[in-house]
């Protein structure tokens, strides 16, 4: 007759004794603690050792779990050789926002006070400080008698009066090949009209470089046009005491933020900028603090997330909130600020945000970031030996060359990039490995051992519940339905325990002949 092995069949079967379970358990030491001999010192010592090991295991596992939930990270630094590198975007701005020759009477009428060229009564404020030639031109432009003001737009003013790359760029070479003003894309920043080389945004592919060193980068010679600098008779956010250009080397994936992140380059010098690409990989919470960037950047005005984009986005929102307008360099569709709004609201509001408000524009680090490490060095230009030649070449005076010409060399130092990567110090696999190792070391257990314990506990609990009569009907029904031919009494009549005690291996039957029978099929397992 076939014996059925499904668990549901015999609800009231008595579970194996603890001794029988212990002797077959894969949990080390259990067989010695629950052996058949009566209580002895040996059993007590085994029990003590087992409990001690269990206590140490719990302590060690608790510490490991706590360590895991601290979410520590480590930083891995690596240098990776590359056969080619994408050359960064290079943004440059003249520190003078508007060319003196391009400021019209209408411009002066509307923006004269903003530029500190006029006072609030449309007068030239302090004629003692003025250059005679400039003063003459300005006095003519500032004569507003019978002048009919025309509409004025700050964006158009910045665009028209800002320095033109075609006038500033005296020479340009990239990887030894000639480049031109056409390779520079106009971009507006807080410095006004600026230019980006290799922006990757004008339909052209991003330029690559195959070697390190000065000959494989960008070399430009610029005329900063100090003759065009506006006279400074007062201080506003639009006036500058400096001469030169501001430069930012950045990834094509982020907009320039040159007023905050740029470095200055002075006329009269050739400045060498040796770069190294750094790819930074940060971890999101809880291991780190970076912002995992989704396809949607979460920014109002930019498609891809970067700290720069976030800050510009935030500054734009702040200005629209405070002044109901935006600066010329800001994205969006709010109206451009008028000169009055610049002076009375936009400039002071943005200054306050940048300098004072510690909370409004806190931008999270993206999880992937490319930045460029820079080393700057400079030499004097022109030399005494070359001053005359350059003056003749560019049809300028030697003094003009010394005060206005600069050379900028930007190149990769070596053709490799640095990866700075945050890595999880302790992952779930490490935690499981540690716990598994400690379980093996201290109590000789595995996951399956734990399942064994649960299985036995389940049998005991089920039996206790069945004894109260909850399973009787089920058991009878099972017997009737399934035709189980072997009752508990039949098994007990065999009384195999005595004969088995001296037999370490027990008697083996085919597995699954009887209910709740382990795969080894030792009779002792379920009868004793």
């Amino acid at each position: 007759m076939e014996l059925k092995a499904e668990e549901e069949e015999v609800g009231g079967v008595q579970p194996v004794s603890i001794q029988a379970f212990a002797s077959s358990s894969t949990l080390h030491g259990l067989a010695h603690i629950f052996s058949y001999e009566r209580l002895s010192l040996k059993r007590a010592l085994w029990a003590l050792c087992f409990l001690g090991s269990l206590a140490v295991l719990l302590c060690v596992c608790t510490e490991r779990v706590q360590y895991y939930f601290h979410y520590h990270h480590v930083t891995k630094l690596d240098e990776v050789a590359a056969s080619q590198l994408t050359f960064p975007a290079v943004t440059l701005c003249n520190l003078n926002e508007f060319r003196f020759s391009q400021v019209s009477k209408n411009d002066l009428y509307h923006a004269g006070e903003l530029l500190a060229l006029l006072n609030n009564r449309y007068e030239i404020p302090d004629t003692q400080m003025a250059d005679e030639k400039q003063l003459e031109i300005l006095q003519d432009k500032a004569n507003f008698r019978s002048f009919k003001p025309k509409p004025f737009n700050m964006r158009e003013f910045y665009d028209r009066a800002g320095h033109d790359i075609r006038d500033m760029l005296l020479s340009c070479h990239f990887r030894g090949e000639v480049c031109s003003a056409e390779d520079f894309k106009v971009v507006f920043t807080r410095y006004g009209k600026c230019y980006t080389f290799n922006s990757g945004r004008d339909g052209r592919p991003r330029l690559k470089t195959m070697k390190g060193g000065t000959g494989n980068g960008l070399e430009i010679m610029l005329d900063i046009q100090q003759d065009e600098y506006l006279p400074v008779w007062g201080e506003t956010d639009e006036t500058s005491f400096e001469a030169g250009i501001k430069v930012q080397i950045h990834s094509q994936d982020e907009p320039p933020f040159i007023d905050q992140l740029g470095f200055g380059v002075a006329p009269g010098f050739q400045t060498f900028v040796a770069c190294q690409e750094q790819r930074l990989i940060y971890l999101p919470p809880p291991w780190g603090t970076c912002k995992a960037v989704t396809m949607d950047s979460d920014l109002d005005f930019f498609d891809s997330y970067s700290i720069t984009a976030c800050r510009i986005d935030c500054e734009t929102r702040y200005l629209v909130e405070n002044c109901n307008c935006r600066m010329v360099h800001m994205p969006g569709d709010a109206p451009y600020c008028t000169p009055e709004q610049y002076k009375e609201c936009a400039d002071p509001a943005l200054d306050f945000l940048v300098e004072k408000d510690q909370e409004y524009c806190v931008c999270e680090m993206p999880c992937n970031l490319t930045r460029y490490g820079k080393e700057l060095s400079m030499v004097k230009i022109p030399s005494k030996a070359s001053a005359k030649y350059l003056a003749k070449k560019f049809n300028k005076s030697e003094q003009y060359i010394g005060e206005n010409i600069l050379v900028l060399d930007i190149f990769f130092e070596v053709l490799n990039y640095e990866t700075i990567e945050q890595k999880k110090a302790y992952e779930i696999a490490g935690l499981l490995g540690d716990i598994g190792g400690q379980m093996g070391l201290f109590i000789g257990a595995s996951i399956l051992t734990v399942l064994e314990l649960f299985d036995y506990a389940y049998e005991v609990i089920k039996h206790k519940l069945c004894r109260r009569g909850k399973c009787q009907k089920e058991a009878k029904r099972s017997s009737a339905d399934k035709g189980v031919a072997l009752s508990l009494d039949d098994v007990k009549r065999h009384n195999p325990c005595e004969s088995l005690r001296g037999h370490p291996a027990g008697m083996t039957y085919a597995a699954n002949i009887l209910p709740h029978h382990p795969a080894r099929g030792t009779f002792e397992d379920f009868t004793c």
Partner: antibody
């Protein structure tokens, strides 16, 4: 129109408590830090306390530290000043103000009198 | 804390006069200084912010200048409505502080 409306003043005994409120309208309240300023009768202006836009950071003048608590409820566009252990020298007109590149506007001022 | 010292404490002047009030900070506050006018029983009225910016609606006879630690408020031609108490305030860093005030009275 940007407006601040203060309320909650009155007469209180020394050692007593009072809670001032300042309801804001016409601007994104949570974007701006706010402050309380007071002026004792016949005296000058004295800054009392400030709070950041999120309410995370709070600041106090030495004269009120430990006794006054500034807070805000951005969902209700309201600024609060909880004043405990009041003293006679806390008698003043209290103004709330919006902090930014310029402190504008100010609330109308509410009178707090501490007297037995 | 940054101390703000205003001078003079009291100033007597006549209509049409040019008047200058000075405010000195105990340490640099960049340009984060405001000037207020206050009349009895009224809330302070903002005149100048960020040292030199004239608040809209304020007559152009009021002007502010200075940066760092030295600041001045100038009224180019006093009008009858200008007789009041004037306060400077630094808002460069907490604790924000006010000057002790300058009472401008009719001579």
């Amino acid at each position: 129109e940007v407006q601040l409306l203060a309320s909650g003043g009155g007469l209180v005994q020394p050692g007593g408590s009072l809670r001032l409120s300042c309801a804001a309208s016409g601007f994104t309240f949570s974007s701006f830090a706010m402050s309380w300023v007071r002026q004792a009768p016949g005296k000058g202006l004295e800054w009392v306390s400030g709070i950041s836009g999120s309410g995370v950071s709070t600041y106090y003048a030495d004269s009120v530290k430990g006794r006054f608590t500034i807070s805000r409820d951005n969902s209700k566009n309201t600024l609060y000043l909880q004043m405990n252990s009041l003293r006679a020298e806390d008698t003043a007109a209290y103004y709330c103000a919006k902090e930014a590149y310029k402190w504008q506007p100010w609330g109308q001022g509410i009178r707090v009198t501490v007297s037995s | 804390d940054i101390q703000m010292t205003q001078s003079p404490s009291t100033l007597s002047a006549s209509v049409g006069d040019r008047v200058t009030i000075t405010c000195r900070a105990s340490q640099s506050i960049s340009s984060w200084l405001a000037w207020y006018q206050q009349k009895p029983g009224k809330a302070p009225k903002l005149l100048i912010y960020k040292a030199s910016n004239l608040e809209s609606g304020v007559p152009s006879r009021f002007s502010g200048s200075g940066s760092g630690t030295e600041f001045t408020l100038t009224i180019s031609s006093l009008q009858p409505d200008d007789f009041a108490t004037y306060y400077c305030q630094q808002y460069n860093s907490y604790s924000y502080t006010f000057g002790q005030g300058t009472k401008l009275e009719i001579k």
